[in-house]
């Protein structure tokens, strides 16, 4: 009997007192469990278990399938076991053909022997094919054959357990190894769109694609800073052996403003985790926001080109865009395009190309845009800078010399006197009167300035210059004086 300290509960005694026993097929299996607190016998082989409450286990006609571990347990939970092999020349292997192996782990080919005294218990490839060179295995008659450190390359490998019985090689039924890949990288996650803009009541639907080596990857949609379980639907595909794809679709059938926020698609496996986010913005109604890309007050020189450019955000999509000048709509000379080709783009650009502007083409240019919810517009005030033009230069009946010039910005008129025939006039003459004639007229046209000087101040022959100038340029007109005795000759104006 097992030797234990007195008073201490001891495990039961099994008779025959062997760890392992061979019984011939057809013979009786008789096992006796001796223990004052006997509870039960348990039999285990592969996935099968049986129990017996009698202290003597009797199987009258042993079959190969009675091969297995017989355990006797007492009321203290202590147990003893004996492993019985039922030797059946016709059935050398007990087989559980399901064979799954986790990559880099060991896996058991479950083909326990019914006769432990056979030789060369090993694995063989099907149809005489050799096993992979790096495949290592450890045989155990009671359990089967353990394949060490399963490789991904062993997936779908066809195997037999093999043993030599009385000089002949015997093969078990075939096994097909299915390898469950190890996670050696985090899942790859992507989202259908990075951001969503919706009006209240519209449906929000977003799809997360999770890619990994197997379907045991975990994934979920989460709302940031919220524990609420989101409703999601799944579709999945196996693209080949170690290429699994899942699509997790999150839907809010009628979005509300307070649904706005960041939604995270989270995936993890035993290697690590990955996530991707999408932003939902729900607005109560649509909007348009216009941003001028140049100053809305534009100064341009006569004959030059200018582009009036706006960027605008429009949600929902813009339906009508137009550029207007003097109540006239441009049919050409402008273009409107989305800022990006991104599906979720709400930003657009509109450009009006004004070419070789004339002084008469200054004014207010307006961009109008609308969608199903709102209208918006922006105005550009365009000023065309023109070089002064001398409209009139006359000697008036009262003896005044008068010069009228037009231009933008408002021209300044200066007067100069040149003695004799000199063309270079340096001595300035102060005007008697200066007036801006159309200051109250339309705001964008040329400004007309009139300036007068008193010719009676000139006592010698010479030339008077009227010079009109602004930021753009200058123009001059001349008056010639000739004295005959005490009388002034006719004054001849010329430019």
């Amino acid at each position: 009997q097992p030797s234990v300290s007195p008073g201490e509960p001891s495990p039961p005694s099994i008779h025959p007192a062997k760890s392992e026993l061979i019984v011939r097929v057809g013979n009786e299996i008789r096992l006796l469990c001796i223990d004052p607190g006997f509870v039960k016998w348990t039999f285990e082989i592969l996935d099968e278990t049986n129990e017996n409450k009698q202290n003597e286990w009797i199987t009258e006609k042993a079959e190969a399938t009675n091969t297995g571990k017989y355990t006797c347990t007492n009321k203290h939970g202590l147990s003893s076991s004996i492993y019985v092999f039922v030797r059946d020349p016709a059935k050398l292997f007990l087989v559980d053909r399901s064979l799954y192996g986790k990559e880099d782990n060991d896996t058991l080919v479950r083909c326990p022997l019914t006769d432990p005294e056979v030789t060369s218990y090993s694995l063989k490839g099907c149809q005489g094919k050799p096993l992979p060179k790096d495949l290592r295995f450890v045989p155990d008659p009671k359990a089967g054959i353990t394949i060490k450190s399963v490789k991904r390359a062993y997936h779908r490998l066809c195997l037999h357990c093999s043993a030599d019985q009385e000089g002949k090689s015997v093969l078990s039924d075939k096994f097909i190894l299915k390898v469950r890949p190890a996670f050696k990288a985090v899942p790859v996650v992507s989202v259908s769109k990075a951001s969503y803009l919706l009006r209240e009541g519209e449906e929000f639907t977003v799809t997360c694609t999770i890619k990994d080596v197997s379907s045991s990857v975990y994934s979920t949609w989460k709302r940031e800073n919220s524990q609420t379980k989101l409703q999601e639907k799944y579709n999945s595909w196996h693209h080949g052996d170690f290429n699994y794809e899942r699509q997790a679709t999150l839907t809010i059938s009628s979005a509300r403003v307070n649904d706005s926020g960041v939604f995270m698609c989270y995936a993890n496996n035993t290697f690590g985790s990955a996530n991707v986010t999408t932003t939902l913005e729900v607005v109560d109604k649509g909007f348009i926001n216009i941003f001028p890309m140049i100053n809305t007050t534009v100064f341009v020189n006569d004959g030059e080109n200018v582009d009036l450019i706006v960027e605008y955000e429009a949600f929902p999509k813009p339906e009508h865009q137009q550029w207007i000048y003097m109540n006239r709509t441009f049919t050409d000379k402008w273009e409107d395009y989305p800022k990006s080709e991104n599906e979720s783009n709400i930003r657009y650009v509109s450009e009006l190309h004004l070419t070789r502007l004339k002084g008469t083409e200054g004014g207010t240019y307006t961009f109008l845009v609308s969608n199903s919810d709102v209208n918006a517009s922006i105005a550009f005030n365009v000023y065309v800078n023109t070089k002064p033009e001398i409209l009139t230069y006359d000697r008036l009946v009262n003896g005044m010399l008068q010069c009228v010039a037009a231009g933008f910005p408002e021209p300044t008129i200066d007067w100069y006197f040149c003695p004799g025939t000199e063309q270079r006039c340096s001595a300035s003459v102060l005007p008697v009167d200066v007036q801006t004639l159309n200051a109250s007229g339309p705001p964008f046209g040329k400004l007309v300035v009139q300036s007068s000087i008193d010719s009676s101040a000139f006592k010698h022959n010479g030339t008077v210059e009227c010079k009109a100038y602004n930021d753009v340029g200058k123009t001059s007109a001349y008056f010639n004086f000739a004295f005959k005795g005490n009388n002034k000759e006719q004054i001849h104006p010329h430019t």
Partner: antibody, heavy 121, light 107 residues
Framework: EVQLVESGGGLVQPGGSLRLSCAAS????????MDWVRQAPGKGLEWVGR??????????EYAASVKGRFTISRDDSKNSLYLQMNSLKTEDTAVYYC????????????WGRGTLVTVSS | DIQMTQSPSSLSASVGDRVTITCRAS??????LNWYQQKPGKAPKLLIY???SLQSGVPSRFSGSGSGTDFTLTISSLQPEDFATYYC?????????FGGGTKVEIK
């Protein structure tokens, strides 16, 4: 060669002690449960006791006639089996055989030649 | 303890005879029964184990049968080297008791 060789027998007075040894060779000693069987002069065979192997946790079992006086032990590193006999009685006089059990049954498939133990004053 | 009763305790037979020795157990021992042959001055030798399995190297004229409590050893054609003492032994429950032996002598 597969064999068992007993040693340590001899003449001993009643109440004395003796230690028998059994040297195993030619097989994997650690795999086997081992027994002692004795045979008094002109009598039949009597099982004395046994020791299990490591798989059987080296458990020992004894015949009622020797329990408490005899101790069986083994040293797997030396491929040796021992029988320590204390408080010897005249009725312990016998040829003592060392015997091997096969791995998967209880029988004695290999025997030593035996060693004679005589308990006499 | 399980008692093993062997009969006859001795028998005389001639070469070529069919010899039968019986062994009875005091309780059912299933097939846990072994047969040994012992010649004078020699160690016993295993002939049959598990009631009917012939030990490797043993001539096929030896056979065993029985299960439960009654067992038989048969020598189909006695040979000169078969004159010896034969023992049965139960290996179900310790102590592993032997029968008293059957001595097979030359007639």
């Amino acid at each position: 060669e597969v064999q068992l060789v007993e040693s340590g027998g001899g003449l001993v007075q009643p109440g004395g002690s003796l230690r028998l040894s059994c040297a195993a060779s030619g097989f994997t000693f650690v795999d086997h449960d081992m027994d002692w069987v004795r045979q008094a002069p002109g009598k039949g065979l009597e099982w004395v006791g046994r020791t299990r192997n490591k798989l059987g946790s080296y458990t020992t079992e004894y015949a009622a006639s020797v329990k408490g006086r005899f101790t069986i032990s083994r040293d797997d590193s030396k491929n040796s089996l021992y029988l320590q006999m204390n408080s010897l009685k005249t009725e312990d006089t016998a040829v003592y055989y060392c015997a091997r059990e096969p791995k998967y049954w209880i029988d004695f498939d290999l025997w030593g030649r035996g060693t004679l133990v005589t308990v006499s004053s | 303890d399980i008692q093993m009763t062997q009969s006859p305790s001795s028998l005389s037979a001639s070469v070529g005879d069919r010899v039968t020795i019986t062994c009875r157990a005091s309780q059912s021992i299933s097939s846990y029964l072994n047969w040994y042959q012992q010649k004078p001055g020699k160690a016993p030798k295993l002939l049959i184990y598990a009631a009917s399995s012939l030990q490797s190297g043993v001539p096929s004229r030896f056979s065993g049968s029985g299960s439960g409590t009654d067992f038989t050893l048969t020598i189909s054609s006695l040979q000169p080297e078969d004159f010896a003492t034969y023992y049965c032994q139960q290996s179900y429950i310790a102590p592993y008791t032997f029968g008293g032996g059957t001595k097979v002598e030359i007639k």
